[in-house]
């Protein structure tokens, strides 16, 4: 499919001008290559009329120009003094006319309306309001006032001052007679339809002395604004319909076959399933304007979109509307990244978020898409060191691997973490990506004690058991804080006995805290990584308490997972309590349960082989 994009249809009137914008991917080659505008012949060729290399055909001499805007990836063709002979099929393109890097444009030039003398022309947008003013003389002040519409050869009564209203105009028309001083009546028509266009006649009086005034009403269908966005990128539709519809329900719909327009999202809470997790409707300003953001653009998102206002929250005849034609460029600069990441309850995920590598200094954000209200994505973590309170100890945003990608790690997963998350920056707003976290059946791969109590001044050893599938990974311990997870020294204690059916490649890696201080209290993670790519993590909360009896602490899985408040008094161990205050998330569902059952290979955060767009918590 050609990545060139422009208007499919351009309509104008004899004597007028048109400006046609064509879009192209702004690669270095494309920016500098030849741009052209050519007319398609009956036998399939395309004859150049104007090009960026200076050629102008005799047909266009003195009335056309072509301007390239390489920084935007667009070029514009302006044609003036249009005649009906200019109607036809054209191409705007790059390179050689026959190469296929082009877009087909149909230009239709029509004859101007043949208007009677003294005709007032009213040009109004679809869905808006028109006021037709009708002057009259004093002798007709007390006589009947009326408005007719010319249908074929016959005038048809639309409204009159005796109270008649044509059924086609019911509920949207009124006739106002100005105060006695002004010899003027006016007809106001709301929610204009395309079918309202035509010739009208105002009349005051019914005899030969009546006053008459001709009016020509032109109802304009909004020309779609062309929008050119990259595959996997995002688009923002800004919809400003005016303060008169500030309190009316708003919608964005996508035109399907014929006149149908399927609601994508509206302010009444409707949202199309295809856009779940990747659309946000920003609330309206006081003037009624609003915007809709769609991210994770797909090929099938291309098409014509309308925004409008109607009490039903969908397109109806007479809705004021704005239109866009969205083209999704498949030659995208935005890299592929998994759209689905899977993890198990108690386990973890590592999400890779792409950003524009030119903006490495921008602030990175990760937020939770909220489906209940159309416009919210509350921040969970940023690259500046802010973490939402409920996520302390289990969420971290890392600038690694860098060079256009950052990593978000979320552990201690529960079913409540399933949902859609957005990666954002405060830089290029087109780089917003969505990832869905799914919680699947299985056990966490890494085994750590539930939570641990250390004693001031003593030594604490905390184990982390890694199954053999991670034999080739780097294993680490780190202390979590709101700016990341600071690496700590750890000891490889040899093969782990926590896994049945696992060979000598399983590993027990311990964290040792010597001479424990109050500052050692907090969250500790053990995890695996390959270079700058992070895999699974497991979290342990270490509480610190006063010395009660001498001895160092060596925490085992079984001992540390004793039931809350259970006394564990074997030699070398002290009481281990689940301290709800220090570990605010120890609900039964959320506690990362460590056990010694056989680890099925599908139990880790996994990659579905069926989808190149899915990533597991420990994949790259």
């Amino acid at each position: 499919k050609s990545p060139i994009f422009g208007p499919e249809e351009v309509n104008s009137v004899e004597g007028n001008s048109v400006s046609i914008t064509c879009y192209y991917p702004p690669t270095s080659v494309n920016r500098h290559t030849r741009k052209y505008w050519c007319r398609q012949g009956a036998r399939g060729g395309c004859i150049t009329l104007i090009s960026s290399e200076g050629y102008v055909s005799s047909k266009y001499a003195g009335r056309a120009n072509l301007t390239n805007f390489p920084e935007n990836g667009t070029f514009v063709v302006n044609i003036a003094q249009l005649s009906q002979d200019d109607s036809g099929r054209y191409k705007c393109g790059l390179g050689i006319n026959s190469r296929g890097l082009s877009f087909d444009v149909s230009l239709e030039v029509s004859q101007g309306p043949g208007l009677l003398n003294d005709t007032k022309v009213y040009t109004v947008d679809l869905g808006r309001t028109v006021t037709i003013n009708c002057p009259f003389k004093t002798e007709n002040a007390q006589k009947r006032k009326s408005l007719y519409k010319q249908i074929g050869l016959y005038p048809v009564l639309v409204i009159d001052s005796s109270g008649y209203v044509n059924p086609n105009y019911t509920g949207r028309i009124r006739l106002d007679i100005q105060g006695t001083g002004q010899l003027l009546f006016s007809v106001v028509i709301n929610q204009l339809r395309l079918s309202d266009a035509g010739q009208y006649l105002c009349q005051a009086g019914d005899d030969s002395n009546s006053n008459k005034k001709n009016a020509d009403l032109q109802v304009l269908k909004p020309e779609p604004e062309l929008v050119y966005e990259d595959l996997r990128g995002s688009v923002t539709f800004h919809c400003a319909l005016g303060p008169e519809v500030a309190n009316v329900a708003k919608f964005l719909c996508r035109q399907s076959s014929g006149e149908n327009c399927d609601v994508v999202v509206n302010t009444l809470g409707k949202r199309a399933p295809a856009f779940e997790g990747r659309i946000l409707l920003n609330p309206q300003d006081k003037d009624g304007s609003f915007s809709v953001v769609i991210t994770g653009l797909r090929k099938e998102d291309a098409g014509r979109y309308l925004c409008g206002a109607h009490s039903d929250g969908q397109l109806q005849e007479g809705s004021p509307i704005q239109a866009w034609q969205l083209f999704v460029n498949e030659e995208s600069t935005i890299p592929r990244s998994p759209t689905v990441v899977k993890g198990v309850a108690g386990g973890s995920v590592a999400v890779l978020c792409p950003y524009n590598r030119k903006e490495s200094k921008s602030i990175k954000y990760w937020c939770l898409w909220e489906g209940a209200q159309n416009g919210r994505c509350p921040l969970l973590v940023d690259s500046e060191g802010w973490v939402k309170a409920q996520y302390e100890g289990r969420l971290s945003l890392l600038e690694e691997p860098g060079n256009g990608t950052f990593t978000v790690i979320l552990n201690q997963l529960t079913s409540r973490d399933a949902g859609f998350y957005w990666c954002l920056t405060n830089g290029d707003t087109l780089w917003r990506t969505t990832v869905e976290i799914k919680i699947i059946e299985g056990e966490p791969n890494l085994k750590v004690p539930g939570n641990v109590t250390a004693v001031l001044g003593e030594t604490l050893k905390v184990p982390c058991h890694f199954p053999c599938k991670f034999s080739s990974y780097e294993k680490y311990w780190c202390k979590w804080n709101n700016t990341g997870c600071q690496a700590l020294p750890s000891q490889d204690e040899g093969p782990s006995k926590a896994f049945v059916n696992c060979d000598e490649n399983s590993r027990l890696v311990s964290l040792t805290l010597n001479l424990v201080t109050r500052a050692d209290e907090g969250w500790y993670w053990c995890g695996v990584k390959q270079g700058h790519f992070y895999g699974e993590t497991a979290a342990v909360y270490v509480a610190v308490e006063e010395r009660k009896a001498a001895g160092s602490r060596d925490v085992s899985l079984a001992k540390a997972d004793a039931a809350p408040d259970e006394k564990v008094l074997d030699s070398g161990f002290r009481e281990i309590e689940n301290k709800a205050i220090q570990d605010p998330r120890l609900f039964a569902e959320e506690k990362a349960v460590a056990d010694t059952r056989d680890q099925a290979d599908g139990s880790r955060a996994s990659v579905d082989s069926g989808s190149s767009e899915e990533q597991g918590g420990s994949s790259r």
Epitope: L280, L379, W386, K388, A389
Partner: nanobody, 131 residues
Framework: EVQLVESGGGLVQAGGSLRLSCAAS????????MGWFRQAPGQEREFVAA????????YYADSVKGRFTISRDNAKNTVYLQMNSLEPGDTANYYC????????????????????????WGQGTQVTVSS
């Protein structure tokens, strides 16, 4: 809701120093940025300094750079403004402000210097610098 109470204002000679404090209470876990703004009689309220509540990144108006320092104590939910080399032009009512974490997409584009981004405001404390 977050409540903010400023203190530390007063009368000081040009060239002198003052330290303003702003204590936050209520739902302080929702705070994202805290900032100081000032308003002189007949003037619009203007940005002075701001601090990111998580990592502590700071932002300053050009007019106070090198003279004023903003800092925070998360444990005490307090933000400070240390004002040195004070000038008569610094005379104003100083207001402390707090901003909630972003929720709407437009929030992510807002800058700490923008007055409209702040959700909560203190009553203000008067600083008068005499020449």
């Amino acid at each position: 809701e977050v409540q903010l109470v400023e203190s530390g204002g007063g009368l000081v000679q040009a060239g002198g120093s003052l330290r303003l404090s702003c204590a936050a209470s209520g739902r302080t876990s929702s705070i994202y940025n805290m900032g100081w703004f000032r308003q002189a009689p007949g003037q619009e309220r203007e940005f002075v300094a701001a601090i990111h509540w998580g990592g502590g990144r700071t932002y300053y108006a050009d007019s106070v750079k090198g003279r004023f320092t903003i800092s925070r104590d998360n444990a005490k939910n307090t933000v400070y403004l240390q004002m040195n080399s004070l000038e008569p032009g610094d005379t104003a009512n100083y207001y402390c402000a707090a901003r909630r974490a972003p929720e709407l997409l437009d929030d992510y584009k807002q800058k700490p210097e923008e007055i409209g981004t702040y959700h909560y405001w203190g009553q203000g404390t008067q600083v008068t610098v005499s020449s």
